[in-house]
């Protein structure tokens, strides 16, 4: 009989500590950093993943033009505050009491302020545009094959319901994947587009979050799809609030 530990891992999140000490010997996994229990049958929330990452030792076929309100994650990594469900708290602060408001994917959507800053609600990111540039290939990929392969990837690897992949655009060498998910569309148990996009981003960078699975091997009709640049734009249900200084910078 194999040891319980051999079977007690989290397939969807390698940044966990698992032990078979749950009810009835159930494998129970907790995210590094937060110690929160995670559901290993689905993707872990981006907030818990970022927290775990910060706790780990340091080592039409026309392309879419992002809206003027689209956010790009320029701030990079930070150690976020997550709520009991693992979602980002609307207000984030650092150790020096600098605070800012974030959206549901943890991207800053206001100017930075002090502890008096109020963030009344967590604003939902309902539209994500993943902008990729692939490495040169002998010829362009067939658009419908590329579309099918990327939809399959989001459905099978990230368990995102197909209805949330709104479109796949392609103008060699640029690929754009549009994810859309309004609050009203997201049912209990549905993977969040923000979480799916984060897992995809980490996969593309060769930093897979999945336990023991090989890295992402994207192929279109057997031809490897190698990404050399990724940009992700986030659109919120309520436009962000930045001062003019930032907008004109």
């Amino acid at each position: 009989h194999t040891a319980a530990q051999d079977n007690c891992t989290c397939p969807t999140n390698k940044m966990t500590v698992c032990s078979p000490d749950g009810p009835g010997g159930r494998c129970q996994c907790r995210a590094l950093g937060s110690g929160m229990a995670v559901d290993c049958s689905t993707l872990t929330s981006k907030c818990l993943l970022l927290k775990a990452r910060m706790s780990a030792p340091k080592n039409a076929r026309t392309l879419v033009r992002p809206s003027e309100h689209a956010l790009v994650d320029n701030d990079g990594l930070y150690d976020p505050d997550c709520d009991p469900e693992g979602r980002f708290k609307a207000r984030q602060c650092n150790q020096t009491s600098v605070c800012w408001c974030v959206n549901s994917v943890g991207v800053r959507r206001t100017d930075k302020g002090d502890l008096s800053l109020r963030c009344d609600e967590l604003v939902r990111t309902h539209h994500i545009l993943i902008d990729l540039r692939h490495r040169p290939t002998a010829g362009a990929f067939n658009h419908s094959d590329l579309d099918a392969e990327l939809r399959r990837l989001f459905r099978e690897r990230y368990r995102l319901h197909p209805k949330f992949v709104a479109a796949v655009h392609y103008e060699q060498p640029t690929i754009q994947i549009e994810l859309r998910q309004n609050t009203s569309q997201k049912a209990a148990g549905d993977v969040d587009i923000g979480d799916a996009a984060y897992y995809f981003e980490r996969d593309i960078k060769g930093e897979s979050l999945f336990q023991g699975r090989g890295g992402l091997d994207l192929r279109v009709r057997g031809e490897p799809l190698q990404v050399e640049r990724t940009l992700i734009y986030y659109l919120d249900e309520i436009p962000p609030k930045f001062s003019m200084k930032r907008l004109t910078a």
Epitope: H1, A3, A4, Q5, N7, S19, P20, D21, G22, P23, G24, G25, R26, C27
Partner: antibody, heavy 116, light 107 residues
Framework: QVQLVQSGAEVKKPGSSVKVSCKAS????????INWVRQAPGQGLEWMGQ????????HYNQKFQGRATLTADKSTNTAYMELSSLRSEDTAVYYC?????????WGQGTLVTVSS | DIQMTQSPSSLSASVGDRVTITCKAS??????LSWYQQKPGKAPKSLIY???RLVDGVPSRFSGSGSGTDFTLTISSLQPEDFATYYC?????????FGGGTKVEIK
């Protein structure tokens, strides 16, 4: 193969304590939880508590909290269940069971009779 | 605590019959349900875990199904050695709770 061998039958007086042992073999003791379940004569199964020898973490059924104590001796691969302040309604067969994901291997049971 | 209501509490059947035992949880238990068989004077024996997974060595005439709050143990063709008491157990959360048991007797 997995084996859980429990200590022999006991007859106890009301108000006293009993300590039932459960010696495990055939697997790594610290890798699996041990649960304790009892069964009064002619009745169903009742869960008492769970101990994980790997970290000495435990959970008790509220009904037995304060009266039951679960321990594990890693040096002898033995789990223990001690029940204090015994009353006649504690007369039952006490089972230890190794659990993983709901799948259980059971000891043969220990009959504890509480009688004045 | 999660209550597990098992039915029927007893049933009479003949060898070869198809037997169905049900277990209803007072709230959703995410398929964390197992089934046990117990014969008089013996310790229980695991049959099914995670609602529908058959334990190694258990005959394929035993099967488990259901999800959410309603679960079923089916014996497709009752054999003489299957006359026993059957219990369900939820292990979705502490405290673990058993159903009241179903005694399967010879008709």
């Amino acid at each position: 193969q997995v084996q859980l061998v429990q200590s022999g039958a006991e007859v106890k007086k009301p108000g006293s304590s009993v300590k039932v042992s459960c010696k495990a073999s055939g697997y790594r003791f610290t890798d699996y939880v041990i649960n304790w379940v009892r069964q009064a004569p002619g009745q169903g199964l009742e869960w008492m508590g769970q101990i994980y020898p790997g970290s000495d973490s435990f959970h008790y059924n509220q009904k037995f909290q304060g009266r039951a104590t679960l321990t594990a001796d890693k040096s002898t691969n033995t789990a223990y269940m001690e029940l204090s302040s015994l009353r006649s309604e504690d007369t039952a067969v006490y089972y230890c069971a190794r659990f993983f994901e709901g799948l259980a291997y059971w000891g043969q049971g220990t009959l504890v009779t509480v009688s004045s | 605590d999660i209550q597990m209501t098992q039915s029927p509490s007893s049933l009479s059947a003949s060898v070869g019959d198809r037997v169905t035992i049900t277990c209803k949880a007072s709230q959703g238990i995410n398929n964390y349900l197992s089934w046990y068989q117990q014969k008089p004077g013996k310790a229980p024996k695991s049959l099914i875990y995670r609602a529908n997974r058959l334990v190694d060595g258990v005959p394929s005439r035993f099967s488990g199904s259901g999800s959410g709050t309603d679960f079923t143990l089916t014996i497709s063709s009752l054999q003489p050695e299957d006359f026993a008491t059957y219990y369900c157990l939820q292990y979705d959360e502490f405290p673990l709770t058993f159903g009241g048991g179903t005694k399967v007797e010879i008709k």
